[in-house]
Amino acid sequence: KNLKSPQKVEVDIIDDNFILRWNRSDESVGNVTFSFDYQKTGMDNWIKLSGCQNITSTKCNFSSLKLNVYEEIKLRIRAEKENTSSWYEVDSFTPFRKAQIGPPEVHLEAEDKAIVIHISPGTKDSVMWALDGLSFTYSLVIWKNSSGVEERIENIYSRHKIYKLSPETTYCLKVKAALLTSWKIGVYSPVHCIKTTVENELPPPENIEVSVQNQNYVLKWDYTYANMTFQVQWLHAFLKRNPGNHLYKWKQIPDCENVKTTQCVFPQNVFQKGIYLLRVQASDGNNTSFWSEEIKFDTEIQAFLLPPVFNIRSLSDSFHIYIGAPKQSGNTPVIQDYPLIYEIIFWENTSNAERKIIEKKTDVTVPNLKPLTVYCVKARAHTMDEKLNKSSVFSDAVCEKTKPGNTSK
């Protein structure tokens, strides 16, 4: 009896794993083995496919074959017993085009109200993605274990932190990779679950801001309690895309180690030009807070986007505010040759209710004030360029008293 060729050969490529699956064409014939040959583009001869010779099952793995993943190859299969079937040729394919991105590896770290997610490619030093390793982006689905309501987060990098979670709550998530340059979407990782911790008695520092004073950076933050020590760490922002890089390590700012105030001052030359992430942690000697939310810090912009200086002319029912160029060390004005928008915040000195005005002009009227009342004003500048969406820190507050009634003219 003539052996029939196997049919329906499927090639599955996930990362560097090459798997072949096929159907037996005749289930009634026992003790049949199967063998594959392959042929590279531009070659006439067929070569035995190692790992896929004399296979008794209907699946084989040819991952050990060192192929050029961008080169088209052709496969053929036949069945063998005493005699052999005719060859069945599989449509030619390019491994890279056919390959799927495998499930990434995921490591989770729990805080009380946040989860840190570390993601790395499932296949280390993959041949398939050797040229694209740094182009991976990831997306994830996260849900509270108790509710199952899913939230999707797209376009994240190898390290991502999800904030505003509840303490002592189990969250589950799964992650998949994408190579947008090749229109490839990967396979989801297994589901990983982690329980957030009990609430930390020490909250993380908040409202971190960087400003420039003389030749120094001044880093300020808010904290709930007194008598604390703080440490500040920095990281090159580009490394968030590539934690596999051995440079990926948060480092101490020496002048901001164990500081006892809610600010620290360090020389501008600590940082070369670039974009950095900064984070702050508090300690009371016994306990330590979790890390603050990270802020992005661009030395180029920080150096030139200083808070505005302004003068106030007080009337009975309004202030006229005249905004000037910020002053550098030595009291010389900074020339800023790019358009700015000004955010002016004012409030009655005896109240916390703030009002806001946003203006492009450098002379601004603050209307509807009460006579003989002390008002405080602070201002900051924003760049109007979409690509350069940056803000200065707020200027120091200036407080003035409005004039008695009927002086508005």
Epitope: H107, E109, A110, E111, D112, V116, H118, R159, I194, K195, T197, V198, N200, E201, P243, G244, H246, L247, Y248, K249, W250, N286, N287, T288, F290, W291
Partner: antibody, heavy 123, light 107 residues
Framework: QVQLVQSGAEVKKPGASVKVSCKAS????????MNWVRQAPGQGLEWIGK????????HFNQKFRDRVTLTVDKSTSTVYMELSSLRSEDTAVYYC????????????????WGQGTLVTVSS | DIQMTQSPSSLSASVGDRVTITCKSS??????LAWYQQKPGKAPKLLIS???TLESGVPSRFSGSGSGKDYTLTISSLQPEDFATYYC?????????FGQGTKLEIK
């Protein structure tokens, strides 16, 4: 697979120094902290310190800070722990143990351990 | 330094028994707790990290629970190879500290 192989047993006199090595293989050496832990005969475990093999940053248990030196040889993926001014109470098995990834935000458990090096201090 | 107090310090049990070992920290350690098993003349072996996460290759009869300052290692059905000394360790604050150990012996 991950392996940490330590140097052999040492006998030292009080006041001397000992240098124990730990050769790592099976993972990216510079991506993980390397810790040192000791265990006196019949006693519990005591953390000595840790080193980042990529840049040699170290953290120590204050108890050992003045007497211990941790160093790295990246070319051979080896970490060294040197303990000076030895006294009889330093007689212990010294272990190297891999810690968390350096890129993690927080410290991690010690997932792989060397086989241990017995250091005996005796006059 | 954070103190880790393990109890009991020794325990006799039989194959098939359910065994619980507890570990208390002097400060909150936010689930940064590991459990290790050590057999005579051998290095410790990591069983559980993050208070509850079972390391790969560790039998599912081992489980960890707890939060804040109180943590527990449970062995649901003791096997002959489980007789050993068990240590807890906190890695929230440096210096990392270990419990004094619990010796699990055959009854």
């Amino acid at each position: 697979q991950v392996q940490l192989v330590q140097s052999g047993a040492e006998v030292k006199k009080p006041g001397a120094s000992v240098k124990v090595s730990c050769k790592a293989s099976g993972y990216t050496f510079t991506s993980y902290w390397m810790n040192w832990v000791r265990q006196a005969p019949g006693q519990g475990l005591e953390w000595i310190g840790k080193i980042d093999p990529s840049d040699s940053e170290t953290h120590f248990n204050q108890k050992f800070r003045d007497r211990v030196t941790l160093t790295v040889d990246k070319s051979t993926s080896t970490v060294y722990m040197e303990l000076s001014s030895l006294r009889s109470e330093d007689t212990a098995v010294y272990y190297c143990a891999r810690g968390g990834r350096i890129s993690f935000d927080y410290d991690a458990a010690l997932d792989y351990w060397g086989q241990g090096t017995l250091v005996t201090v005796s006059s | 330094d954070i103190q880790m107090t393990q109890s009991p310090s020794s325990l006799s049990a039989s194959v098939g028994d359910r065994v619980t070992i507890t570990c208390k920290s002097s400060e909150v350690i936010y689930n940064r707790l590991a459990w290790y098993q050590q057999k005579p003349g051998k290095a410790p072996k990591l069983l559980i990290s993050g208070a509850t996460t079972l390391e790969s290759g560790v039998p599912s009869r081992f489980s960890g629970s707890g939060s804040g300052k109180d943590y527990t290692l449970t062995i649901s059905s003791l096997q002959p190879e489980d007789f050993a000394t068990y240590y807890c360790q906190q890695y929230w604050n440096k210096p990392f500290t270990f419990g004094q150990g619990t010796k699990l012996e055959i009854k």
